[in-house]
Interface confidence: low
């Protein structure tokens, strides 16, 4: 079949203490969320075919204003990247908040069957749940 | 034939006042704005093709410093929603300009024929009109 | 073939002073940047197929705080554009660190074979080569 | 430096045309709006036309419409206004501006040339 | 007749303050017209000096200073040096996509 492997998630939680984790979920029953091919394994996402993808990713910050991002030594900061197989685990996006309280791009990266991506947010600030503020997907474009 | 809809739109002027609404405008005279398939009815996009669509915007705040859109209680915000039907109406991708003049972001979603987009600036400053600062678009990904 | 032309770009290096030019590396051996369609002339990106492209960028600047950011008169910013052939120059994607350390922006738009893209950073602060935080890249998506 | 340096100027019968040149410098023409300011002798100033930094859209005022056009070349970094059927009250100092790029669409004007002379006279 | 009112000319001592006005012939001025005040001395191009209602371009000196107040858009010169004698523009933003500028103020600075 045509490799049209697409996903859209919003965020389900983030994890506990020391697991700098965001979850996430999809499907139809919970808005405009949605898995086709990918899934969700304990809340990150798996790639199930070959191909260069784009990802993409908006995190907004809850409770926030300039003054909460700037005022912290170490920024609050969001990662994606491949965290398990543990052999092809990488960085692929990183993006601080710097005086801001949303960040938000996309990139085009190969990913591999197998390859679960992880988002990482890192500070003491906590993300948004509205789904028009935080979501994360991906899209399989080319072999 | 094979649902390649795709949009991309320059700014062509704010609503009147009490109008959130970005007005668009779109078309090769104007520059490297371009509709095929969607279509503009009334300066908002309307969605001519059912599936998911791949929905970037990029906004740039005229006359614009980060004193300018720190100084407001109520930061300038963007959304970029489904305005009618009424019965679909949601917002899709929200963001705030917290101390920086531009926000871009993109997002996967279903939209239906019929769906009409608006994107609301909410706040007293005013959207550059340059092309290369301000621009909307979608381009259907999959059915 | 299918026009999939696709690129995805790390930074190499900054120009000479009064070049304002970022210059873009890419392959397989360089870590997860690649080049399928498009070619780097004296690392810039040319087109060899006419398209409508998505074209996404992430910049993140070096030993950088939003003081860095803020402390200047002039905003340092980031555009991307059309630099050759002269008679299709044109500024496509432009934004500034207004308080921010990283801008990301995407658009779409129409290309032709020959066109080589430019990305000029002016300002006195120097981009990151991180491969995570700094990438440039492009999508043909239809004719 | 920004410099804006119009020609074209000169003296026309009623009913004649001239081109006017605008060569631009010292900024990257092609990311902004340009204009037409024209200031009539002893009077004051008043705006003429407009055209977007890729030069799709433009704008006119409602005293030259359908006889003025502006148009822009981004490659040469030139901005032009060729006027027809030109009217004594066309005589004026005609200015190239750059709009600051500050508002979707209220132009600020912070950079003029010099100014360029046309007389409509018989 | 002029849309944008202007004073047709003011006087002021150096080192004095004197404020211009700019007003509308029908109606109150707002920040929603976006005042804008240009600096012409005789034989020079407008220059750029307030935009915004109350934004100072860059290179105008803080004795330049923009408001609205009594329905009218404002341009306070405050410590008015010899060299700020000339006419001033202001322009407003009434209906997309032009300014209207008046008529000018003839500013004179009298020793």
């Known amino acids: 079949s045509l490799g049209w492997d697409i996903a859209e998630l919003q965020l389900n939680h983030t994890g506990p203490q020391q697991d700098p984790r965001l979850y996430w979920q999809g499907g139809p029953a919970l808005g405009r969320s949605f898995l086709r091919g990918p899934e969700l394994d304990k809340g990150q996402l798996r790639i199930r075919r070959d191909g260069i993808y784009m990802v993409h990713i908006q995190v907004t910050l809850a409770i926030c204003s300039s003054t909460s991002t700037s005022r912290h030594h170490h920024p609050t900061t969001l990662a994606v990247g491949i965290c398990s197989p543990a052999s092809r685990s990488i960085s692929l996006l990183r993006l601080s908040f710097h005086q801001g309280c949303t960040i938000a791009s996309q990139r085009l990266t190969p990913l591999a069957r197998g390859d679960t991506l992880c988002t990482n947010l890192t500070g003491t600030l906590l993300p948004s749940r509205n789904t028009d503020e935080t979501f994360f997907g991906v899209q399989w474009v080319r072999p | 034939s094979l649902g390649w809809d795709i949009a991309e739109l320059q700014l062509n002027h704010t609503g009147p006042q009490q109008d959130p609404r970005l007005y668009w405008q779109g078309g090769p005279a104007l520059g490297r704005s371009f509709l095929r398939g969607p279509e503009l009815d009334k300066g908002q996009l309307r969605i001519r093709r059912d599936g998911i669509y791949m929905v970037h915007i990029q906004v740039t705040l005229a006359i614009c410093s980060s004193t300018s859109t720190s100084r407001h209680h109520h930061p300038t915000t963007l959304a970029v929603g489904i305005c009618s039907p009424a019965s679909r109406s949601i917002s899709l991708l929200r963001l705030s300009f917290h101390q920086g003049c531009t926000i871009a972001s993109q997002r996967l979603t279903p939209l239906a024929r019929g769906d009409t987009l608006c994107t609301n600036l909410t706040g007293t400053l005013l959207p550059s009109r340059n092309t290369d600062e301000t621009f909307f678009g979608v381009q259907w990904v999959r059915p | 073939s299918l026009g999939w032309d696709i690129a995805e770009l790390q930074l190499n290096h900054t120009g000479p002073q009064q070049d304002p030019r970022l210059y873009w590396q890419g392959g397989p051996a360089l870590g997860r940047s690649f080049l399928r369609g498009p070619e780097l002339d004296k690392g810039q990106l040319r087109i060899r197929r006419d398209g409508i492209y998505m074209v996404h960028i992430q910049v993140t600047l070096a030993i950088c705080s939003s003081t860095s950011t803020s402390r200047h008169h002039h905003p340092t910013t980031l555009a991307v554009g059309i630099c050759s052939p002269a008679s299709r120059s044109i500024s496509l994607l432009r934004l500034s660190f207004h308080q921010g350390c990283t801008i990301a922006s995407q658009r779409l738009t129409p290309l032709a074979r020959g066109d080589t893209l430019c990305t000029n950073l002016t300002g006195t602060l120097l981009p990151s080569r991180n491969t995570d935080e700094t990438f440039f890249g492009v999508q043909w998506v239809r004719p | 430096e920004v410099q804006l340096v119009e020609s074209g100027g000169g003296l026309v019968q009623p009913g004649g045309s001239l081109r006017l040149s605008c060569a631009a410098s010292?900024?990257?023409?092609?990311?902004?709006?340009m204009n037409w300011v024209r200031q009539a002798p002893g009077k004051g100033l008043e705006w003429v036309s407009d055209?977007?930094?890729?030069?799709?859209?433009?704008y006119y005022a409602d005293s030259v419409k359908g006889r003025f056009t502006i148009s822009r070349d981004n490659a040469k970094n030139t901005l032009t206004l060729q006027m027809n059927s030109l009217k004594p009250e066309d005589t004026a100092l005609y200015y190239c501006?750059?709009?600051?790029?500050?508002?979707?669409?209220?132009?600020?004007?912070?950079?003029w040339g010099q100014g360029t002379q046309v007389i409509v006279a018989s | 007749q002029a849309v944008v009112t202007q004073e047709p000319s003011l006087t002021v001592s150096p080192g004095g303050t004197v404020t211009l006005t700019c007003g509308l012939k029908?109606?109150?001025?707002?920040?929603?017209?976006?005042p804008t005040w240009y600096q012409q001395t005789p034989g020079q191009a407008p220059r750029l000096l307030i935009y915004?209602?109350?934004t100072r371009h860059s290179g105008v000196p803080s004795r330049f200073s923009g408001s609205i107040s009594e329905n009218k858009a404002a341009l306070t010169i405050t410590g008015a040096q010899p060299e700020d004698e000339a006419e001033y523009f202001c322009?407003?933003?009434?209906?997309?996509?032009?300014?209207?500028f008046g008529g000018g103020t003839q500013l004179t600075v009298l020793s």
């Open positions: 501006v750059r709009d600051a790029g500050y508002s979707n669409h209220v132009p600020i004007f912070d950079s």
């Open positions: 010292g900024f990257t023409f092609s990311v902004y709006y």
């Open positions: 055209i977007n930094n890729e030069g799709g859209t433009t």
């Open positions: 029908s109606g109150s001025v707002t920040s929603t017209n976006f």
């Open positions: 915004n209602t109350n």
């Open positions: 322009a407003l933003f009434i209906s997309n996509p032009s300014v209207e």
